[in-house]
Structures are given as structure tokens and as C-alpha cells.
Interface confidence: low
């Protein structure tokens, strides 16, 4: 069978076999090597000799096989814009950024470039528990029934009604959606505003 | 060649507004954020705020946040700042910079600069 | 707010000396600055982007260095076009300015 060709190699047809790692060079009509992740072009290829790549300098990079002649510049998460660093930039790979906690994107452009402040939701709710947190803006959702949740909060969530009966006591007022059930002695008597409600 | 041209001077009278021009040629607008920096008569450079042109998103600084008003217009490809109740602290140089592609932090291109003088 | 500072705020030297202008970042700002050079009556010039990033067309003399909170622009020999004004600017966490060193010969 015939050896695969190696860049450079005449290309009619305007493509070359490897479309990731090739591309075609007009002016030449070849196939010729891309640049690996973490490299750029320093010197393009001609017909007799392939591209030569040479590694990105610091504080830059390429995230992939390229014939881009020069790197990217790294580019910080911006405090101002509500971005953190979840891990730092290498020559292969930009700079990683999330919202900061307590913070959703408000702006997309590929990638976050703005995050705002989640809203707070009221007592008797919670945020919806999202698949990736900072994506989008909380949707409240209602305690479901024997939870409560008793502030204003972007975060707070639901909790479990207090069982007096688990503490040896009994309970003095239900619990709701926005208060946990009171709970008193056994012995105690009940608070007057409560003491008509009980049937003996 | 990407130049920016600023009107060298403008005069305006305390507790009015002053629209101030930066028109890009050499490249489109749409591919920048156009930045705003100031330097009173003999001191530094502060930076004021940027607008992204194809969306008109801006963001100032909070000392600037009710004096400037930024605005970009993509079909003359060019971009405004409008300062209002002028005070004579409003006295200074004002440049435009775009931040392109190929130098996402950093201005290597300025407008000239227009000379705000506020008197009455 | 990281403030940005300039030391010297003058300086004065002669043609052909090495020059060392320092700027100083109130936190770490990862390498994230520019230098400027500005003459009297013009607009600013990009000198050194990314600390150490030599602007096109900008001559070999000048070159930039540091890492952290402290950064350097240095100009190897000293040329009469080179008395001018010269601002650092840090580019993380918002655009700032240093307050600006002055050179002028001797």
C-alpha cells in the first residue's frame, strides 16, 4: 500500500486528510502541520519544508492545534466583574473563572464575563438546587411540606420541621413554611392565645 | 492603520453638558471596547470606564458613574462621552482607546485628546 | 481599590546611562501591566504590555520585568528622545494608573 504522505504534501482538492492537525496553504496548494496546543507558527511552511512551531512565552497560550502566529495573552478573572480563578493559565489553556460565591453570569460571550448577585429568596422558599452552580439566577421554589426556612437568603435552605416528641417534649405551635414548630415542656401550660384551641 | 480622531477642544459652562467624539478609522468599532481616560492639567492618567460597542454595555468607574455617559454609534464608527453638570474639576484632557483583539488590555492606539475647559 | 505606585516621581539622568523606573502594586496583580511613555501635548504611547511584552516598534532599549507586586522599566542607554513621562498601568481587577515618573536629562 502507499505511505501515508507527511506534511507538506500537494493538495488538489483544497483539503488535507487530518483536518485537526493540518490545514491547507493557499498560495503553495499543500497540507501542512498545525501547531500543537501550547505552541504558535514561527515559521510557515513552504512546499520543501513543514511549519515550524515554537512554544508559547509566558503568561500566553493556544488552546489548540493552530497555524496562528502568535499566542494568546492570558487574561486575568476580573474581581470588578464578579470573576474568580478556579485554576491559573498555562500555555495550553486560558485562564479558568467562575462567579464568585453568592454570584450568577449575568453575561455570556463564549464565556462569563459578568456575574451579578444571586437574588435573595424570601422566607418560606429556596433556591431551586441547580446542575452547575453560577449559571443562572436563583428560581425560588416553596418549602415542601413539614421544611421551613425563615430569612432572606440567596443560599439558606429548607429545613427539616423540629419533632418536639424526639426531645421529650410536645409541641406548643405547628411549624409552617416560614417558622419551626415550637416545642415545651410537657408540664408546662400552654400559652394563652393557644389554650382555647386544645381539645381535652 | 487604526487611527482615532478627537476634536481638540471644547468649552463648557458650569452645571451643563459636553458630548465629546471618537471616530475609529482603520478599524470596525464592532471588534473593540472603546475606553475613556482622563488627565487633569498636570497630573496622571485616570481611567473613566469602556462601552462595548455592539451591544452598548457599558461600565464606569464609580466616581464617573452620574458625570459620564458613554454611547457608540457602529455605523460611523464612532463613540461618544457625554459629561453632564460640569464642574471646573471637569477641566482636563479626555482620550479615547480602544482595546483590540490583538492587545485586549492594553491601548496601543489613542485619540489625540479634546480639552474640556469649563467656565462661566 | 489596588493602588498603583511610581518611584521615582523625577528623575534626571544622562544620555547612554541605564535607567530603572519602578512600580509598585498595593496587592498582587499577577503580571498584569503595561507601561506607557507620554510627551509633553501628546497622547500616551504603549511602551511594554504583559509586563515584558515589547509593543511593536518600540525600540530594544526598553524592556520590563517583575512578577507579584513589584515591576520594573528599564531603558539599557539612555537617548534625548526618551525624557518624557512614563506611567505604568495594571490591568487586573479594573484599569489603574500609577501617578507617573518624570525623566528629563541632564
Known amino acids: 500500500s502507499q505511505p501515508q504522505a507527511v506534511p507538506p504534501y500537494a493538495s488538489e482538492n483544497q483539503t488535507c486528510r487530518d483536518q485537526e492537525k493540518e490545514y491547507y496553504e493557499p498560495q503553495h496548494r499543500i497540507c501542512c502541520s498545525r501547531c500543537p496546543p501550547g505552541t504558535y507558527v514561527s515559521a510557515k511552511c513552504s512546499r520543501i519544508r513543514d511549519t515550524v512551531c515554537a512554544t508559547c512565552a509566558e503568561n500566553s497560550y493556544n488552546e489548540h492545534w493552530n497555524y496562528l502566529t502568535i499566542c494568546q495573552l492570558c487574561r486575568p478573572c476580573d474581581p470588578v466583574m464578579g470573576l474568580e480563578e478556579i485554576a491559573p493559565c498555562t500555555s495550553k489553556r486560558k485562564t479558568q473563572c467562575r462567579c464568585q460565591p453568592g454570584m450568577f453570569c449575568a453575561a455570556w460571550a463564549l464565556e462569563c464575563t459578568h456575574c451579578e448577585l444571586l437574588s435573595d429568596c424570601p422566607p418560606g422558599t429556596e433556591a431551586e438546587l441547580k446542575d452547575e452552580v453560577g449559571k443562572g439566577n436563583n428560581h425560588c421554589v416553596p418549602c415542601k411540606a413539614g421544611h421551613f426556612q425563615n430569612t432572606s437568603s440567596p443560599s439558606a435552605r429548607c429545613q427539616p420541621h423540629t419533632r418536639c416528641e424526639n426531645q421529650g417534649l410536645v409541641e406548643a405551635a405547628p411549624g409552617t413554611a416560614q417558622s419551626d414548630t415550637t416545642c415545651k415542656n410537657p408540664l408546662e401550660p400552654l400559652p394563652p392565645e393557644m389554650s382555647g384551641t386544645m381539645l381535652m | 492603520e487604526v487611527q482615532l480622531q478627537q476634536y481638540g477642544a471644547e468649552l463648557g459652562k458650569p452645571g451643563t453638558s459636553v458630548k465629546l467624539s471618537c471616530k475609529v478609522s482603520?478599524?470596525?468599532?464592532?471588534?473593540?471596547?472603546i475606553h475613556w481616560v482622563i488627565q487633569r492639567p498636570g497630573k496622571g492618567l485616570e481611567w473613566i470606564g469602556r462601552i462595548d460597542p455592539t451591544n452598548g454595555n457599558t461600565i464606569c468607574t464609580e466616581k464617573f458613574k452620574n458625570k459620564a455617559t458613554l454611547t457608540a454609534d457602529l455605523s460611523s464608527n464612532t463613540a461618544y462621552m457625554q459629561l453632564s453638570q460640569l464642574k471646573s474639576d471637569d477641566t482636563a484632557i479626555y482620550f479615547c482607546?480602544?482595546?483590540?483583539?490583538?492587545?485586549?488590555?492594553?491601548?496601543?492606539?489613542w485619540g489625540q485628546g479634546t480639552l474640556v475647559t469649563v467656565s462661566s | 481599590d489596588i493602588q498603583m505606585t511610581q518611584s521615582p516621581s523625577q528623575l534626571s539622568a544622562s544620555v547612554g546611562d541605564r535607567v530603572t523606573l519602578s512600580c509598585k502594586a498595593s496587592q498582587n496583580i499577577y503580571k498584569y501591566l503595561n507601561w506607557y511613555q507620554q510627551k509633553l501635548g501628546e497622547a500616551p504611547r504603549l511602551l511594554i504590555y504583559s509586563t515584558n511584552i515589547l509593543q511593536t516598534g518600540i525600540p530594544s532599549r526598553f524592556s520590563g520585568s517583575g512578577s507579584g507586586t513589584d515591576y520594573t522599566l528599564t531603558i539599557s542607554s539612555l537617548q534625548p528622545e526618551d525624557a518624557a513621562t512614563y506611567f505604568c498601568q495594571k490591568y487586573y481587577s479594573g484599569f489603574t494608573f500609577g501617578s507617573g515618573t518624570k525623566l528629563e536629562m541632564k
Open positions: 482607546a480602544p482595546t483590540t483583539l490583538t492587545t485586549p488590555d492594553s491601548f496601543a492606539y
Open positions: 482603520g478599524y470596525n468599532i464592532g471588534n473593540t471596547y
